[in-house]
C-alpha cells in the first residue's frame, strides 16, 4: 500500500482491545481545503514505540486503514480511497507493547465536515434566574452549531451538559450555578445538523465563582490613639482564599472576591458625610470615635454576606485644656487649636444616656486665634448644655470634613452643663462634735463630682460670729468630710461649703450654725 | 469467490442462550463490515448488529445488553452471542459483507 492512500488489507497487528483509560482519543476530522482532509486525536500515556493506525470502515462495507507512525496527525487526500461524500466510520488503532488500544470512533461525511472552533475570546458570564448564562460572539462564517459544556469543582470530577443547538451570530449556554463553591467550565462546538462532524477542542477554562462570596472571616485590632488624635485599624486576620478548581488556580478571572471595607462614624452625626468604602487591603486610621465597620465580599454576581463590628469610641479623657468661660451672653470653649483652617465637631451628651442621644455642632473652618486657641460659642437660647447635668464632650478636627477617614481626635472631657456654680453647691453639711476643740463637717457629694475632672476641690468656710474671723479649708474632691479643729467653747460658728472647677468658684452652701458646749466639771 | 456460513441456531428456551457463528472466505473480517440481519415470517429483514474491521460495534436497540457480536481475525469468523432470548427474538439469521449473503440459521425461542 502507498503511504498516501488508505490500505484494504488487514493492519499489520493484532485485534484492538475494547478500550482502555490509556490509548488514543479525541478523534477529529475535518475538510482542511477543497480536496484535502486531516484527522487528529490525542495519545494518552507513554509514547515510547507507539504506532497509530488511522481505521476507516466505507459505507460500501470495506474497511482499510492509514498508518501514521508515531504522528498523531494525518493529512489525506479525496483520492486517497476514503469516500468524502459518503458517510464513513473512522477511529484510530494505536499498537504499543504488544497490544492494541482503538479509540472511539467518529461517524461523519467528511466532505461537509468543517473544524470548528470553540468558543474563541471572550465569554461573558451572567447571572440569569438562579442560573449561569454564558454568551460569545460566534467563530467567523460558522454560524450554526451544536454546544456542549464540561465543568468541575475543586472537589468534583467533570461532569458534561448540553448547550443545544445554535443558529446566530451570537451563542449562548445556560449552566448550572453553585451556591457556594467556585466552577470551572469549557465549551466545545460542533457542526449542526452535520451527521458525526467532530467536536472542536474544549475552549480555555471560564472560570465562575460560587454565587455567593464566602463570607469573609477577618479579625480587626484597633491602636490606642496617638497625639495626633488618630488610632490604626489593624487586619489581625486575613480573609480565606477561595478553592478553586484546577484549571482556575493561578491566573483565573472571573472567581475574584473582592473584599471592601465600609466605615460608619457614628460619633459627629452633624458632619456631612458619615460613610466610606475602602479596599480591604488599605488599612485606615480612624479619629476616636465611634465606628461600625463591615467586611464586605463581592464577586463578579454582587455582594455577599457580610461581617460587622463595632468599634466603640476611645474613653480616655485628658486633662486637657478645654477652658469653658460662661458668660451673660453664654458659654465659650476653647481649645489648643490643630491647625490652620480646620473644620471641628464638637459632640456632648449627658453621661450615662445612649450613645444615640449626642448632640453635634459643626464649626466653619477656623483658623487659631492669636493665643492658638479654637473657640465655639452658643448662646443660652441654644439650650446647648443647658440642663445642670454632667456632659460628656468630645472635639474632633479635620481639614477634609468630607473624607471620613481624615477625622482626629482633639480631646474629650467633661462638662457640667447649666448654671454649675449653683448646682453644684454641697448640700445636707452636718456639724458633730469631734474633741473639746474641733467638730467633724460632713456634706453630701456635689452634683459636680458625678463629672470626672469637673470638680477641682471643695472649700470649707468657717466663721467666728464673735470676732468675725473667717478660715477656709482646701477639701480633695474626693472626700466629703474635715475636721475643723482650734474652735472654742461657748463661741458660735457658721459653716459653709462650696464646690469649686477649675474654672468657676461654687456658690455657698447654707450657713450652718453650731457651738462647743462649755464643759463644767464637777 | 467470497462465502460467508451461518451456523448455531435452534431451539431455545425463552431467557436462554445461543452463540451464532459466521465463517467468512474471500475476504477479511478485519477490512470489511460484517452484519448480522434476521428476517422473522411476514416481516421486514432488519440489521441486529455489526462488526466494523474487527473492532466498531453497533447494535439495534432492542438488542443492546442482550447480544454480543464478536471476531476472530484469525479464523475470520464472526459471532453473536445472544443471551436473555425472548419470543420475539424468533427469526432467519443471516450474515452479510460487502455485497455477499450467507443462506441464514434459523433461531426459534419457545417454551
Known amino acids: 500500500c502507498r503511504t498516501s492512500e488508505c490500505c484494504f488489507q488487514d493492519p499489520p497487528y493484532p485485534d484492538a482491545d475494547s478500550g482502555s483509560a490509556s490509548g488514543p482519543r479525541d478523534l477529529r476530522c475535518y475538510r482542511i481545503s477543497s480536496d484535502r482532509y486531516e484527522c487528529s486525536w490525542q495519545y494518552e500515556g507513554p509514547t515510547a514505540g507507539v504506532s497509530h493506525f488511522l481505521r476507516c470502515c466505507l459505507s460500501s462495507g470495506r474497511c482499510c486503514y492509514f498508518a501514521a507512525g508515531s504522528a498523531t496527525r494525518l493529512q489525506f487526500s479525496d483520492q486517497a480511497g476514503v469516500s468524502v461524500l459518503y458517510t464513513v466510520t473512522l477511529w484510530v488503532e494505536s499498537w504499543a507493547r504488544n497490544q492494541t488500544e482503538k479509540s472511539p470512533e467518529v461517524t461523519l461525511q467528511l466532505y461537509n465536515s468543517v473544524k470548528y472552533e470553540p468558543p474563541l475570546g471572550d465569554i461573558k458570564v451572567s447571572k440569569l434566574a438562579g442560573q449561569l448564562r454564558m454568551e460569545w460572539e460566534t467563530p467567523d462564517n460558522q454560524v450554526g452549531a451544536e454546544v456542549q459544556f464540561r465543568h468541575r469543582t475543586p472537589s468534583s470530577p467533570w461532569k458534561l451538559g448540553d448547550c443545544g443547538p445554535q443558529d446566530d451570530d451570537t451563542e449562548s449556554c445556560l449552566c448550572p450555578l453553585e451556591m457556594n463553591v467556585a466552577q470551572e467550565f469549557q465549551l466545545r462546538r460542533r457542526q449542526l445538523g452535520s451527521q458525526g462532524s467532530s467536536w472542536s477542542k474544549w475552549s480555555s477554562p471560564v472560570c465562575v465563582p460560587p454565587e455567593n462570596p464566602p463570607q469573609p472571616q477577618v479579625r480587626f485590632s484597633v491602636e490606642q490613639l496617638g497625639q495626633d488624635g488618630r488610632r490604626r485599624l489593624t487586619l489581625k486576620e486575613q480573609p480565606t482564599q477561595l478553592e478553586l478548581p484546577e484549571g482556575c488556580q493561578g491566573l483565573a478571572p472571573g472567581t475574584e472576591v473582592t473584599y471592601r471595607l465600609q466605615l460608619h462614624m457614628l460619633s459627629c452625626p452633624c458632619k456631612a458625610k458619615a460613610t466610606r468604602t475602602l479596599h480591604l487591603g488599605k488599612m485606615p486610621y480612624l479619629s476616636g470615635a465611634a465606628y461600625n465597620v463591615a467586611v464586605i465580599s463581592s464577586n463578579q454576581f454582587g455582594p455577599g454576606l457580610n461581617q460587622t463590628w463595632h468599634i466603640p469610641a476611645d474613653t480616655h479623657t485628658e486633662p486637657v485644656a478645654l477652658n469653658i468661660s460662661v458668660g451673660t451672653n453664654g458659654t465659650t470653649m476653647y481649645w489648643p487649636a490643630r491647625a490652620q483652617s480646620m473644620t471641628y465637631c464638637i459632640e456632648w451628651q449627658p453621661v450615662g444616656q445612649d450613645g444615640g442621644l449626642a448632640t453635634c455642632s459643626l464649626t466653619a473652618p477656623q483658623d487659631p486665634d492669636p493665643a492658638g486657641m479654637a473657640t465655639y460659642s452658643w448662646s443660652r437660647e441654644s439650650g446647648a448644655m443647658g440642663q445642670e447635668k454632667c456632659y460628656y464632650i468630645t472635639i474632633f478636627a479635620s481639614a477634609h470634613p468630607e473624607k471620613l477617614t481624615l477625622w482626629s481626635t482633639v480631646l474629650s472631657t467633661y462638662h457640667f452643663g447649666g448654671n454649675a456654680s449653683a448646682a453644684g453647691t454641697p448640700h445636707h453639711v452636718s456639724v458633730k462634735n469631734h474633741s473639746l476643740d474641733s467638730v467633724s463637717v460632713d456634706w453630701a457629694p456635689s452634683l459636680l463630682s458625678t463629672c470626672p475632672g469637673v470638680l477641682k476641690e471643695y472649700v470649707v468656710r468657717c466663721r467666728d460670729e464673735d470676732s468675725k474671723q473667717v478660715s477656709e479649708h482646701p477639701v480633695q474632691p474626693t472626700e466629703t468630710q474635715v475636721t475643723l479643729s482650734g474652735l472654742r467653747a461657748g463661741v458660735a460658728y457658721t459653716v459653709q461649703v462650696r464646690a469649686d472647677t477649675a474654672w468657676l468658684r461654687g456658690v455657698w452652701s447654707q450657713p450652718q450654725r453650731f457651738s462647743i458646749e462649755v464643759q463644767v466639771s464637777d | 469467490e467470497v462465502q460467508l456460513v451461518e451456523s448455531g441456531g435452534g431451539l431455545v428456551q425463552p431467557g436462554g442462550s445461543l452463540r451464532l457463528s459466521c465463517a467468512v472466505s474471500g475476504i477479511s473480517v478485519r477490512s470489511s463490515v460484517v452484519n448480522w440481519y434476521r428476517q422473522a415470517p411476514g416481516k421486514q429483514r432488519e440489521l441486529v448488529a455489526l462488526?466494523?474491521?474487527?473492532?466498531?460495534?453497533k447494535y439495534a436497540d432492542d438488542v443492546k445488553g442482550r447480544f454480543t457480536i464478536s471476531s476472530d481475525s484469525a479464523k475470520n469468523t464472526v459471532y453473536l452471542q445472544m443471551n436473555s432470548l425472548r419470543p420475539e427474538d424468533t427469526a432467519v439469521y443471516y450474515c452479510?459483507?460487502?455485497?455477499?449473503w450467507g443462506q441464514g440459521t434459523q433461531v426459534t425461542v419457545s417454551s
Open positions: 452479510s459483507a460487502l455485497e455477499y
Open positions: 462488526i466494523m474491521g474487527g473492532a466498531i460495534r
